[in-house]
Interface confidence: medium
């Protein structure tokens, strides 16, 4: 629908509270270094302007696009050039180039201080003193650190954040009530951010067709009773929502997401029997619930796929008439029958089917040529099955921490040029696949594991893209979205790598390690492990294990010592010498 004033339309649709929250998220995701107070001032100015447009849609500037209005506002920031450097050049451009320019300058790894959680009493006081500012600060801090966070979902997180403080700041034991809730929100938030980052990468790097294929496969698994045309409708609408959010059009995105949730709930009879509970919830909870809803049961007596897609004499005719719709039908039919497959596997199968038809429909005897196409699927299915089986066995044998260490060594040897913090972060996340997925029965392991690995490897890809250092990473990240994981799995030790010079400073530790949380201590040890492998890429598992065991013993000993700092200095030198000898450095 054409509206005289887009800003008035969105303000009326979303309401003032959501409008202000979404504009704050949008601004914080674009100008990630700006102080909170500056953003709040800009948001208030935009909101006051929006209200004048609601009162009179014909008022001056009310007919301007949201990109024009928001971009003009961002470009009033006085310190733009000093703070953001070349990003200030965006302001010399006209829309839509200016918005594209802002998008290109979003930083996945902004140089911002780690968020330190204050004491519970301090947080509760701040919450009671000014609830609105406290919650805005939460939106701001998350949005600037996660510039692709799914904005309508961040509103849902903020709602839960508020609920946690409302409940726990009145509790007898505030900390016991609040801290687990905050931990859960933090972990879920990181996962949500990473999942959305993959959706945006899919759209931006591989195009709408790639995203739609992913959505057809996932929604067909989730809603196997829905007709193909219904799934296609949902895919089209979902693609619009994510295109908008990934493009910084957060007001449109939130509005369209609400419309999609409304449509799904009004048509749940033709979509899924699992939606009833979701559809009884308020809007933010409803949308989140729908996005996470379990797969519906598969319809009984689904016929064999071979009849329509291999045996039929009309395969090439159907394919030629409308390739994408026919391939979409193939993907839909395959996915609804296989909730036990990962989405990326389903997409590999569809790609194989497409490649076969491209070749065979031009052949002298097409049917003879594509008759065995389903046989080509077998190795593609077995590869992730075997990999998951092996890695789950390893995880069960080692436990999460040591499993992460095994992956750290494996990935450092594959791509040693990648920065140590990135290797640690990515390998730790890869290692979490064990506790996340290996507990599941066989039928749920692959969709859990391989689709999770796609999300984690995308983190590696976006971090590496900012500062490319490895041709192998670039190749695996850019050649094929669905083959990223097999590409990284297939990498062997990089024989071209020149080992890093030994630097004793890297292996010098201090008493502050003793006061760290268990997680932080693990990260310190894992950082040292990556550095060891970079110095000695040919070190055996046994050698590395011996050094790491010595290192753990050294930390434990010195943390128990009376004079910790002296212990770390003296014992540390001995450890470095012993390690050098053990590894032949």
């Amino acid at each position: 629908d054409a509206h005289k004033s887009e800003v008035a339309h969105r303000f009326k649709d979303l309401g003032e509270e959501n409008f202000k929250a979404l504009v704050l998220i949008a601004f914080a995701q674009y100008l990630q270094q700006c102080p909170f107070e500056d953003h709040v001032k800009l948001v208030n100015e935009v909101t006051e302007f929006a209200k004048t447009c609601v009162a009179d849609e014909s008022a001056e500037n009310c007919d301007k696009s949201l990109h024009t209005l928001f971009g003009d506002k961002l470009c009033t920031v006085a310190t733009l050039r000093e703070t953001y450097g070349e990003m200030a050049d965006c302001c010399a451009k006209q829309e839509p180039e200016r918005n594209e320019c802002f998008l290109q300058h979003k930083d996945d790894n902004p140089n911002l201080p780690r968020l330190v959680r204050p004491e519970v009493d301090v947080m509760c006081t701040a919450f009671h003193d000014n609830e609105e500012t406290f919650l805005k600060k939460y939106l701001y801090e998350i949005a600037r650190r996660h510039p692709y966070f799914y904005a309508p979902e961040l509103l849902f997180f903020a709602k839960r954040y508020k609920a946690a403080f409302t409940e726990c700041c009145q509790a007898a034991d505030k900390a016991a009530c609040l801290l687990p809730k905050l931990d859960e929100l933090r972990d879920e938030g990181k996962a949500s951010s990473a999942k959305q980052r993959l959706k945006c990468a899919s759209l931006q790097k591989f195009g709408e067709r790639a995203f739609k294929a992913w959505a057809v496969a996932r929604l067909s698994q989730r809603f196997p009773k829905a007709e193909f045309a219904e799934v296609s409708k949902l895919v089209t609408d979902l693609t619009k929502v994510h295109t908008e959010c990934c493009h910084g059009d957060l007001l449109e995105c939130a509005d369209d997401r609400a419309d999609l949730a409304k449509y799904i709930c009004e048509n749940q009879d033709s979509i899924s029997s699992k939606l009833k509970e979701c559809c009884e919830k308020p809007l933010l909870e409803k949308s989140h619930c729908i996005a996470e809803v379990e797969n519906d049961e598969m319809p009984a007596d689904l016929p064999s796929l071979a009849a329509d897609f291999v045996e039929s004499k009309d395969v090439c005719k159907n394919y030629a008439e409308a390739k994408d719709v026919f391939l979409g039908m193939f993907l839909y039919e395959y996915a609804r029958r296989h909730p036990d497959y990962s989405v990326v596997l389903l997409l590999r199968l569809a790609k194989t089917y497409e490649t076969t038809l491209e070749k065979c429909c031009a052949a002298a005897d097409p049917h003879e040529c594509y008759a065995k196409v389903f046989d080509e699927f077998k190795p593609l299915v077995e590869e992730p099955q075997n990999l998951i089986k092996q890695n789950c066995e390893l995880f069960e044998q080692l436990g999460e921490y040591k499993f992460q260490n095994a992956l750290l060594v494996r990935y450092t040897k594959k791509v040693p040029q990648v920065s140590t913090p990135t290797l640690v972060e990515v390998s730790r996340n890869l290692g979490k696949v064990g506790s996340k997925c290996c507990k599941h029965p066989e039928a749920k392991r692959m969709p859990c594991a391989e689709d999770y690995l796609s999300v984690v490897l995308n983190q590696l890809c976006v971090l590496h893209e900012k500062t490319p250092v490895s041709d192998r990473v670039t190749k695996c990240c850019t050649e094929s979205l669905v083959n990223r994981r097999p590409c990284f799995s297939a990498l062997e030790v990089d024989e071209t790598y020149v080992p890093k010079e030994f630097n004793a400073e890297t292996f010098t530790f201090h008493a502050d390690i003793c006061t760290l949380s268990e997680k932080e201590r693990q990260i310190k040890k894992q950082t040292a492990l990556v550095e060891l492998v970079k110095h000695k890429p040919k070190a055996t598992k046994e050698q590395l294990k011996a050094v790491m065991d010595d290192f753990a013993a050294f930390v434990e000993k010195c943390c128990k010592a009376d004079d910790k700092e002296t212990c770390f200095a003296e014992e540390g030198k001995k450890l470095v010498a012993a390690s050098q000898a053990a590894l032949g450095l």
Partner: nanobody
Framework: EVQLLESGGGVVQPGGSLRLSCAAS????????MLWVRQAPGKGLEWVSV????????YYADSVKGRFTISRDNSKNTLYLQMNSLRAEDTAVYYC????????????WGQGTLVTVQS
């Protein structure tokens, strides 16, 4: 009983336009995706366009993309096909059908309306 009744066919010159209609009854039209298919003389069936029950999305065969527009009016239980820039190869009997639940099989058909494009 499901009934689909097409109309609007006729003879038209190349480059000309026609608008086909399909009146539906006997089923819940507003919850059914619909499509147009055609059969040229001596040829097999070719699907032309699909429209979702809500009106979006729509899909078109590559051969008609940019020239044909499918639409529907759920309040009138009617499906439409606006055909512009007609070519000789568009000559066929046009049928409206209820979109298949999943496989490439069509449950319900109309009797068809003939479109002839000739100079």
């Amino acid at each position: 009983e499901v009934q689909l009744l097409e109309s609007g066919g006729g003879v038209v010159q190349p480059g000309g336009s026609l608008r086909l209609s399909c009146a539906a009854s006997g089923f819940t039209f507003d919850t059914s995706s619909m499509l147009w298919v055609r059969q040229a003389p001596g040829k097999g069936l070719e699907w032309v366009s699909v429209i979702h029950q809500s009106g979006t999305p729509t899909y078109y065969a590559d051969s008609v993309k940019g020239r044909f527009t499918i639409s529907r009016d759920n309040s009138k239980n009617t499906l439409y096909l606006q055909m512009n820039s007609l070519r000789a190869e568009d000559t066929a009997v046009y049928y409206c059908a209820k979109f298949p639940s999943s496989r490439m099989k069509f449950d319900y058909w109309g009797q068809g309306t003939l479109v002839t494009v000739q100079s």
